[in-house]
């Protein structure tokens, strides 16, 4: 404990952000809300039937740099968007599936929309 009159620089506390979560709620989440020191995200993925699956949740600060930029995955489509500007900001994120590349028509299932 510091003595009276001794000054000390405040240790910056990590900002706690609340996010909506769906399919990615940790065990301790309440009312589909999770907390993080990092980012809120909303993600869209294409399932085996070609249908879009939208999910959301919290991303820890560690490693969120590569989570929040789209990383290629083979023969399937996925897109993620992240935000930090306010609590539950991911309610307003609407990522879209990236366009099919030519090779996906060869390698993956063909879905007529």
């Amino acid at each position: 404990k510091k003595e009276d009159g001794e000054s000390t620089a405040p240790t910056p506390r990590p900002k706690v952000l609340r996010c909506k979560c769906h399919h990615h709620c940790p065990e301790d989440s309440v009312n589909n809300i999770c907390s993080t020191d990092g980012y809120c995200f909303t993600m869209i993925e294409e399932d085996d039937s070609g249908l879009p699956v939208v999910t959301s949740g919290c991303l820890g600060l560690e490693g969120s740099d590569f989570q929040c930029r789209d990383t290629p995955i083979p023969h399937q489509r996925r897109s993620i968007e992240c935000c930090t500007e306010r609590n539950e900001c991911n309610k307003d994120l609407h990522p879209t599936l990236p366009p099919l590349k030519n090779r996906d028509f060869v390698d993956g299932p063909i879905h007529h929309r």
Partner: antibody
Framework: QVQLQQPGAELVKPGASVKLSCKAS????????MHWVKQRPGQGLEWIGM????????NYNESFKSKATLTVDKSSSTAYMQLSSLTSEDSAVYYC?????????????????WGQGTILTVSS | DIQMTQTTSSLSASLGDRVTISCRAS??????LNWYQQKPDGTIKFLIY???RLHSGVPSRFSGSGSGTDYSLTIRNLEQEDIATYFC?????????FGGGTKLEIK
């Protein structure tokens, strides 16, 4: 930070089964695929399969389909691999590895965080 | 299954050297090529994903390149802590497969 804890070693008799564990911490367990990899002494790495903790969905390497069964316990953030009908060929180090990317249904191929491995010895 | 071949099983180099480790796939893997480092104590680290993207915390002296079936990992200015076995892995097609490894030793 992401941590995957595996027991150091297991000794089992031929013909028996064993259930290897991998306790995860430092991230939302249900959000990432967990992979299992085998390494025989002095050899390369072999991918056994993967499980998504949220859905329980699995993908197996055909070579291990009759040997390995992957499960999870979400409440304890633990992944398990049961190996059956053990022979000396199953003596190896077994690693669990968490994927890089958050995923719900898509399959992702990046083994970003590894456990220390469990040395399995099958001997009478 | 896609076969991954690391033709050089062991490699000797001096500290400060530039080292290149190569990996070949039996078919086009569309840049879904990852690199791992295994230390003598068995610890495995993820280094590079999708051919050339550095995982967080990996020193910038590591780099990856390649396309189609041919890929390589380069370590510039080799350091003592880089002494390990390096494995490539294809993530294009299930089952995922690894190369046999290249053991890097100090001259």
């Amino acid at each position: 930070q992401v941590q995957l804890q595996q027991p150091g070693a297991e000794l089992v008799k031929p013909g028996a089964s064993v259930k290897l564990s991998c306790k995860a911490s430092g991230y939302t367990f249900i959000s990432y695929w967990m992979h299992w990899v085998k390494q025989r002494p002095g050899q390369g790495l072999e991918w056994i399969g993967m499980i998504h903790p949220n859905s329980g969905s699995t993908n197996y390497n055909e070579s291990f389909k009759s040997k390995a069964t992957l499960t999870v316990d979400k409440s304890s953030s633990t992944a398990y691999m049961q190996l059956s009908s053990l022979t000396s060929e199953d003596s190896a180090v077994y690693y669990c590895a968490r994927d890089l990317l958050i995923a719900t249904v898509v399959v992702t191929p990046y083994f970003a965080y590894w456990g220390q491995g469990t040395i399995l010895t099958v001997s009478s | 299954d896609i076969q991954m071949t690391q033709t050089t099983s062991s490699l000797s180099a001096s500290l400060g050297d530039r080292v290149t480790i190569s990996c070949r796939a039996s078919q086009d893997i569309s840049n879904f090529l990852n690199w791992y480092q295994q230390k003598p104590d068995g610890t495995i680290k993820f280094l590079i994903y999708y051919t050339s993207r550095l995982h967080s915390g990996v020193p910038s002296r590591f780099s990856g390149s390649g396309s189609g079936t041919d890929y390589s990992l380069t370590i510039r200015n080799l350091e003592q802590e880089d002494i390990a076995t390096y494995f490539c892995q294809q993530g294009n097609t299930l089952p995922y497969t690894f190369g046999g490894g290249t053991k890097l030793e100090i001259k």
